[in-house]
Interface confidence: medium
């Protein structure tokens, strides 16, 4: 068959038919259905939802829908022995206790199985001691405390505000500083947007609201007991002492009512500057310990959570490709939630459901995609991306040979201001072209394209007339596909105005107040932003699965490689004397980037001219495009992070959510002036430049003419 014969209508017509079939009303209905009870990973309720989704995807018309189960390490509070924090007096009497649960939102008072706020994977313990306020507990916050203020956190309980960086990094930093416990809290400065009411009257965080979340430092390992391999029936499991990424000190989250009680008595040093002050009526003193009259009082944590090997269930749906069934385009998002999951994840799951329904409708009318589309409803994302990672570990050989692209589909919204896209540079042109074809849902942009409103509201810092597209970091289910396997990946959602709303994430993130009503009343009453996100995610999947030539532009990788090389070079040049002393040169990297640019340019020219009716040549060119992302994978991984193998991008070592470019070089240079052995440190910089230069050159050569 010629490449178009698989589809009985023209590709343009297909895309339009697919997009036109997506309906806001359906997304709304699916969101309601998915959010009426909690769907915590490892629970019966989430298993039942998996079976419901399996059944509905079959009804929608997918060729097959299977459950893939794994037995992974999860963490739960002890039902009879709740977690809390106390202030104790000199006699050991508890004179204040933090709340045991969040006040339930209106209409949900009688819902059972709402897991109380906890930090998943916290070890048990009842440490007591003086409190130290550590701001956001970022690397730079601990530098400020230890180096500038000479405050020692060893043996102290630290209290840190949520925001800016992944909570697992905060805990890791506290451990390294010698703390014996961590209290995490949501400060109104970060989780209460000015001019907006608290839930249930608005989308702000009430004082009793608390953010749940895992505090692991997995670095891409998946199940802590089976790193690198699937947690199947015959798995060999590590002992808990050898488990990957578990915290070693007790951790617990609280809301700002309770935080006020802990922080208002703080004594010791004043905050170093205004960036350490939040919005509570407290001095934000750093400590250690309480002031004057209260100096004999201590803080005590009571943590009794347990880690348990528990069965989880992914739902994997297949729509077989008509021409290239051995090429996989994957759309995946998680199903498990901390409580109701009104935004995270069900605003994403509802969109995936509607995309599956639309694809199924086309299939029932006789259409098939050119390539196979896999749909996934991942479990246990909230516990460390476990469902997606275990499935990818189980299917790694197929994925590394057949994986074309992965599109992530967690929360569809974190605001309602404009589009936000993070993706591989290979997808930039795909995203630009697609958004030019879609209508903007934004007020004031009626009749204009999504590209236009997005570019106006979120302009690229480098290229005028283009929108900002960010680097992929982690903290979501694309991690294993992109960072470990080197499969081109992307994600899209509607976001807030970062210029005017500086709070971290959205205020009700991972709280009991993340309900259907939150979305329907305050974020997207018409579900028009959800529909737009469905069009973007679905449109990307459609193009990736159906275009004759893969919609990847390797020239965009060349542009960013140059930008990243310039950036890392300028960081290194902050140490000109050492670069001279240790003969540190970036020439090899710049040379490799230059070669990549030239080869990518020639490849793109050939891509315009080759005979697309020749299936062998077409497949050859497409394979070069598909395997380009794979070529950036170093099989040895990054130092101390074997499952982060992408040489161009990795999650930041200081914030899992953020992407870092040339992470090997970046980490080698980080805080290099404080290293005890500068010769060794600069030697590692040189080694990392060598690895990066080699990898870029090797990737370039995959785009050269094959013979």
């Amino acid at each position: 068959k010629s490449s178009n014969e698989a589809t009985n209508i023209t590709p343009k017509h297909n895309m339009k038919a697919f997009l036109d079939e997506l309906k806001a009303e359906n997304i709304k209905k699916f969101l309601y259905n998915f959010t009426q009870i909690p769907h915590l990973a490892g629970t019966e309720q989430n298993f039942q939802l998996a079976k419901q989704i399996q059944s509905q995807w079959k009804e929608f018309g997918l060729d097959s829908v299977e459950l893939a189960h794994y037995d992974v390490l999860l963490s739960y509070p002890n039902k009879t022995h709740p977690n809390y924090i106390s202030i104790i007096n000199e006699d050991g009497n508890e004179i204040f206790n933090t709340s045991l649960f969040e006040p339930p939102p209106p209409g949900y008072e009688n819902v059972s199985d709402i897991v109380p706020p906890f930090s998943a994977f916290s070890p048990q313990g009842m440490p007591e001691g003086d409190l130290v306020y550590v701001n956001y507990a970022r690397t730079e916050d601990f530098f400020k405390l230890e180096r500038d203020m000479k405050i020692n956190c060893s043996g102290k309980i630290v209290i840190a505000r949520y925001g800016k960086v992944f909570r697992g990094n905060k805990v890791k930093n506290a451990q390294l500083a010698g703390a014996k416990g961590v209290i995490l809290y949501s400060d109104p400065a970060d989780y209460f947007a000015p001019g907006v009411k608290s839930y249930p009257d608005g989308w702000n965080l009430p004082g009793g609201g608390v953010q749940r979340g895992n505090i692991l430092n997995l670095n891409g390992a998946g199940d802590p007991l089976t790193p690198g391999y699937p947690a199947n029936e015959y798995a060999y499991r590590r002992g808990i002492a050898e488990a990957v990424g578990l915290p070693s000190i007790p951790v617990h989250p609280i809301g700002y009512y309770d935080a006020q009680k802990l922080l208002e008595k703080m004594g010791g040093s004043a905050p170093p500057d205004s960036s350490w002050r939040g919005s509570l009526k407290v001095p934000y003193n750093v400590g250690p310990g309480f002031t004057g009259n209260f100096s004999t009082q201590k803080v005590k944590m009571h943590i009794h959570s347990t880690n348990e090997v528990t069965r989880i269930y992914n739902v994997i749906g297949t729509l077989r490709g008509a021409v290239e069934p051995d090429r996989y385009v994957i759309l995946g998002g998680h199903r498990d939630s901390w409580v109701f999951g009104g935004i995270d994840p069900q605003s994403g799951a509802a969109v995936v459901h509607e995309i599956v329904r639309s694809f199924g409708t086309l299939k029932k009318e006789g259409w098939r995609p050119r390539r196979t589309i896999l749909f996934a409803s991942w479990d246990a994302e909230e516990f460390g991306l476990l469902g997606s990672t275990e499935w990818a570990e189980e299917n790694s050989r197929l994925l590394q040979e057949r994986g074309v692209a992965y599109i992530n589909a967690d929360s569809s919204i974190e605001g309602n201001y404009t589009l936000r896209v993070d993706c591989t540079p290979l997808m930039y042109s795909l995203v630009h072209n697609l958004t030019k074809e879609l209508k903007s849902p934004d007020e004031g942009f009626e009749g204009k394209s999504l590209y236009e409103s997005w570019t106006k509201k979120s302009p690229s810092p480098e290229f005028s007339g283009m929108p900002r597209i960010s680097k992929l970091g982690s903290g979501n289910d694309f991690e294993v596909f992109f960072q470990r396997l080197g499969i081109a990946s992307g994600r899209a959602r509607y976001t807030k105005n970062w210029e005017t709303n500086k709070f971290s994430g959205y205020p009700l993130y991972h709280s009991v107040y993340e309900t259907y009503e939150l979305v329907e009343k305050f974020y997207d009453p018409m579900f028009k932003y959800h529909l737009t996100v469905a069009q973007v995610r679905g449109g990307m999947v459609f193009e990736l699965a159906n275009s004759i030539v893969l919609p990847f532009d390797c020239r965009d990788y060349a542009v960013v490689l140059r930008k990243y090389a310039d950036k890392i070079y300028s960081i290194s040049m902050k140490h000109p004397q050492e670069m001279k002393t240790y003969s540190v040169s970036f020439d090899s990297l710049f040379s490799a980037v230059k070669n990549f640019t030239e080869i990518a340019s020639k490849f793109s020219e050939r891509l315009q001219d080759f005979d697309k009716s020749n299936p062998i040549v077409l497949r050859m060119m497409n394979d070069q495009l598909m395997f380009l992302e794979r070529a950036f994978i170093d099989p040895l991984g990054l130092p101390d992070r074997p499952f982060y193998r992408h040489v161009i991008y990795a999650p930041s070592s200081h914030n899992k959510y953020a992407g870092e470019s040339f992470p090997g070089i970046y980490d080698a240079l980080f805080d290099i002036e404080s290293k005890v052995d500068p010769s060794k440190a600069w030697g590692e910089v040189k080694r990392q430049i060598y690895v990066a230069a080699f990898t870029v050159q090797a990737a370039a050569e995959t785009l050269s003419e094959v013979a």
Epitope: S198, D201, Y256, K281
Partner: antibody, heavy 122, light 111 residues
């Protein structure tokens, strides 16, 4: 420092209306509910209602519906209460009071104006 | 509406002794471990001043001799040891639902 400065005393005739003001400073005016409370001489406190300046949302005690009208001007960070069809039972001191962080859904009134005395007399 | 009943209407306490004021709500103002009950102090010619929020939390700047307790419908404000400057009228108020309502007040006199 948070401050609520209320307008001065009013002497008004029965049947007339009066509009008293409460100028806020030292915090984000739009972001907190502003409450109004009545206190008759030698009596207790009565909650009249509240306004959310950011969007003008109001809630009233049923007893004061039609009697009190709450408004707010974000540009001047000032809340207003208009009292209409005044009679002798409306003679009282009226306080404005801000709600703490939680937007007043579950929270207390943490800062109060000094009060405005309204006397209804012919 | 939730009716708040304070008792006693007035009391006289010797300097250094304990003053106990009770407040009963006509229905529970506690949900999920939070009690939406607050206490205020008012001196003649002054606006009320917040002392205790959410039943037991001391407002910053308020002396530690003030404490609050209770849940459900029954709440108590304790002052110990009473000082001269504590002579005032004390009010309880709930914020469980709309409308907000206050207790009738308790006048504290120092003997």
């Amino acid at each position: 420092e948070v401050q609520l400065q209320q307008s001065g005393p009013e002497l008004v005739k029965p049947g007339a209306s009066v509009k008293i003001s409460c100028k806020a400073s030292g915090y984000a005016f739009s972001s907190s509910w502003m409450n109004w409370v009545k206190q008759r001489p030698g009596q207790g406190l009565e909650w009249i209602g509240r306004i959310y300046p950011a969007d003008g949302d109001t809630n009233y005690n049923g007893k004061f519906k039609g009697k009190a009208t709450l408004t707010a001007d974000k540009s001047s960070s000032t809340a207003y209460m208009q009292l209409s069809s005044l009679t002798s039972v409306d003679s009282a001191v009226y306080f404005c009071a801000r709600c703490g962080w939680d937007g007043g859904v579950y929270y207390a009134m943490d800062y109060w104006g000094q009060g405005t005395s309204v006397t209804v007399s012919s | 509406d939730i009716v708040m009943t304070q008792s006693p209407a007035s009391l006289a306490v010797s300097l250094g002794q304990r003053a106990t004021i009770s407040c009963r709500a006509s229905k529970s103002v506690t949900t999920s471990g939070y009690s939406y009950m607050h206490w205020y102090q008012q001196k003649p010619g002054q606006p009320p001043k917040l002392l205790i929020y959410l039943a037991s939390n001391l407002e910053s700047g308020v002396p530690a001799r003030f404490s609050g307790s209770g849940s459900g419908t029954d709440f108590t404000l304790n002052i110990h040891p009473v000082e001269e400057e504590d002579a005032a009228t004390y009010y309880c108020q709930h914020s469980r639902e709309l409308p907000r309502t206050f207790g009738g007040g308790t006048k504290l006199e120092i003997k």
